[in-house]
Interface confidence: low
């Protein structure tokens, strides 16, 4: 009679993490009598996966009833596969011996590859805010995927970016892999509403890539532009001077009025108007009693935005044309508009 052969028909099996792997094995003969065992790996360090005769293997079930005398199907199923289960599995036939069973014939092996989904990409930006025209770096990380092949793309508002570097670790064989990418993004004044998106495509995702996002509103600082104007006289001896603070982000802003270099009033931006691009506008006014001044007045609007060095704009108020009266102290108010501008 022809000698028994152990046949493992599948050279390789690819299984998604969490699913069940079926490892097929058949024998060509019932003789010799003896148990079957499954191992991962070969040689002295091989790991026992299933022993027909003894042991407890909760994740393993047999495809057929191995206690049937004429059974020649020794296929097994391994449940809840993880990347750590990857490797080459051998179906080994033993023949009855005394005191121990003796290894008789091994199958050629089936390589189990585990497809593990990458974790949701995590995008992180710079620790400090940057202003338009500056280049900032964003990092994207995703872990735990297998096989190693993976595609990572960067987008800004749906437009693909090209300036980035990506590494997949480790370089050698591993049960699972990680990807790390750094993209450089040039900020523009319109980026308050912008998003940077890291998109990861992998065989396990069936064409539906994972995305991680970062809002540039957390990264950008748009410095304000200032304009100081003198309004028509509201009442005799009173001049209204306004300071328009335009196109700034974030909202954190403190404004100080100075009269001839002396602090007149300090206020914090409250009722701002929002532009379409996400930046803010704000206006503060100062009511100056010109009769309190003998000489021309230099009015300065000084703005400290988001903890940055102050910027200022000055306006020379001519008082010579106004009657000189003994007057009251300088009065000041501020106003905000509820209109929503979208530039």
């Amino acid at each position: 009679e022809e000698e028994l052969q152990v046949i493992q028909p599948d050279k390789s099996v690819l299984v998604a993490a969490g699913e069940t792997a079926t490892l097929r094995c058949t024998a060509t003969s019932l003789i010799p009598v003896g148990p079957i065992q499954w191992f991962r790996g070969a040689g002295p360090g091989r790991e026992l996966i299933y022993n027909q005769k003894e042991g407890h293997f909760p994740r393993v079930t047999t495809v057929s009833d191995l206690t049937k005398r004429n059974n020649m199907d020794f296929s097994i199923r391994i449940g809840n596969i993880t990347p750590a289960d990857a490797g080459t599995y051998y179906c080994v036939k033993f023949r009855k011996g005394s005191p121990d069973d003796v290894e008789f014939k091994s199958g050629a092996g089936t390589e189990l590859s585990v497809r593990a989904k990458p974790s949701a990409p995590v995008v992180s930006g710079p620790a400090a805010r940057a202003t338009p025209q500056h280049t900032v770096s964003f990092t994207c990380e995703s872990h735990g995927f297998s096989p190693r092949d993976i595609t990572l793309k960067w987008f800004k508002n749906g437009n693909e970016l090209s300036d980035f570097q990506t590494n997949v670790d480790p370089v050698g064989e591993s049960v699972s892999y990680s990807i790390h990418s750094t993209a450089k993004v040039v900020l523009t004044r319109e980026d308050v509403h912008s998003q940077v998106i890291c998109e990861v495509a992998h065989v396990t995702l069936q064409g539906d890539p994972l995305r991680g996002t970062a809002n540039l509103s957390e990264t950008i600082r748009v410095p304000p532009t200032l304009e100081v104007t003198q309004q028509p006289v509201r009442a005799e001896n009173q001049v209204n001077v306004t300071c328009q603070v335009r196109k700034f982000y974030p909202q954190r802003l403190q404004l100080t009025w100075l009269e001839n270099g002396n602090v007149s009033r300090t206020e914090t931006a409250s009722t701002v108007t929002e532009n379409k691009d996400g930046t803010y506008n704000w206006m503060s006014w100062l009511l100056v009693n010109v009769s309190a001044h003998r000489d021309d007045v230099k009015l300065t609007c000084q703005v400290e935005h988001d903890g940055q060095p102050a910027v200022s704009k000055s306006h020379d108020l001519k008082v010579s044309a106004h009657p000189k009266e003994q007057g009251s102290n300088t009065a000041a108010e501020n106003t905000g508009s509820n209109e929503r501008n979208i530039y």
Epitope: N157, G158, K276, R340, N341, I342, Y343
Partner: antibody, heavy 122, light 107 residues
């Protein structure tokens, strides 16, 4: 092809509620801002509301603010308009419409549904 | 809110005529203006975006111009299928507002 189909219109009494739906197909719904626009019988177009691609930003016309709520379910490719405290002046054909650019809103409406009629009458 | 004043409210012209519609914004809206065509019983259709850009698939006889507060929409040679109501729309501020519409008819 890109398609928007509104539903949920009908006759309703003043003060009651109605929910309109807009089923989207033929494009990546989750990437686009969406609008509701209405048109009273024999009148012009009136913008009602917009919602950003991810639902995080919503804007409304003053005439519906506090009464109407725009929402979306990206898993179902569906846009909604919940209309409460309905008034006779809300009687109109309601259209849903798609923004032309992904991830943004405020560029207009390049694809419109066929409209669903809402009649508020006692 | 920004008011959009469209004129004329209706017009009648012959096939082949040049038709011009104007739209005036109550404040500066830069070029954030679209033009739509609505045929009776149908949904509106985007023709021009950002004041002067022709939407894909729209015939070249339609054009738009303007910036700031004054805008013009032109049909260079009126065709029978152009019978419709035309609307301008500003997108500079929320709430978005439309012009009152211009009904175009054939003489």
């Amino acid at each position: 092809q890109v398609q928007l189909v509104e539903s949920g219109g009908g006759v309703v009494q003043p003060g009651r509620s109605l929910r309109l739906s807009c089923a989207a197909s033929g494009f990546t719904f989750s990437s686009y801002g969406m609008h509701w626009v209405r048109q009273a019988p024999g009148k012009g177009l009136e913008w009602v509301a917009v919602i950003s691609y991810d639902g995080s930003n919503k804007y409304y016309a003053d005439s519906v603010k506090g009464r109407f709520t725009i929402s979306r379910d990206n898993s179902k490719n569906t846009l909604y308009l919940q209309m409460n405290s309905l008034r006779a002046e809300d009687t109109a054909v309601y259209y849903c419409a798609k923004e032309p650019r992904s991830y943004w809103h405020g560029y207009g409406m390049d694809v419109w549904g066929q409209g669903t009629t809402v009649t508020v009458s006692s | 809110d920004i008011q959009m004043t469209q004129s004329p409210s209706s017009l009648s012209a012959s096939v082949g005529d040049r038709v011009t519609i104007t739209c005036q914004a109550s404040q500066d809206i830069s070029n954030y203006l679209n033009w739509y065509q609505q045929k009776p019983g149908k949904a509106p259709k985007l023709l021009i975006y950002d004041a002067s850009n022709l939407e894909t698939g729209v015939p070249s006889r339609f054009s738009g111009s303007g910036s700031g507060t004054d805008f013009t929409f032109t049909i260079s040679s009126l065709q029978p299928e152009d019978i419709a109501t035309y609307y301008c729309q500003q997108l500079s501020n929320y709430p978005i507002t439309f012009g009152g519409g211009t009904k175009v008819e054939i003489k």
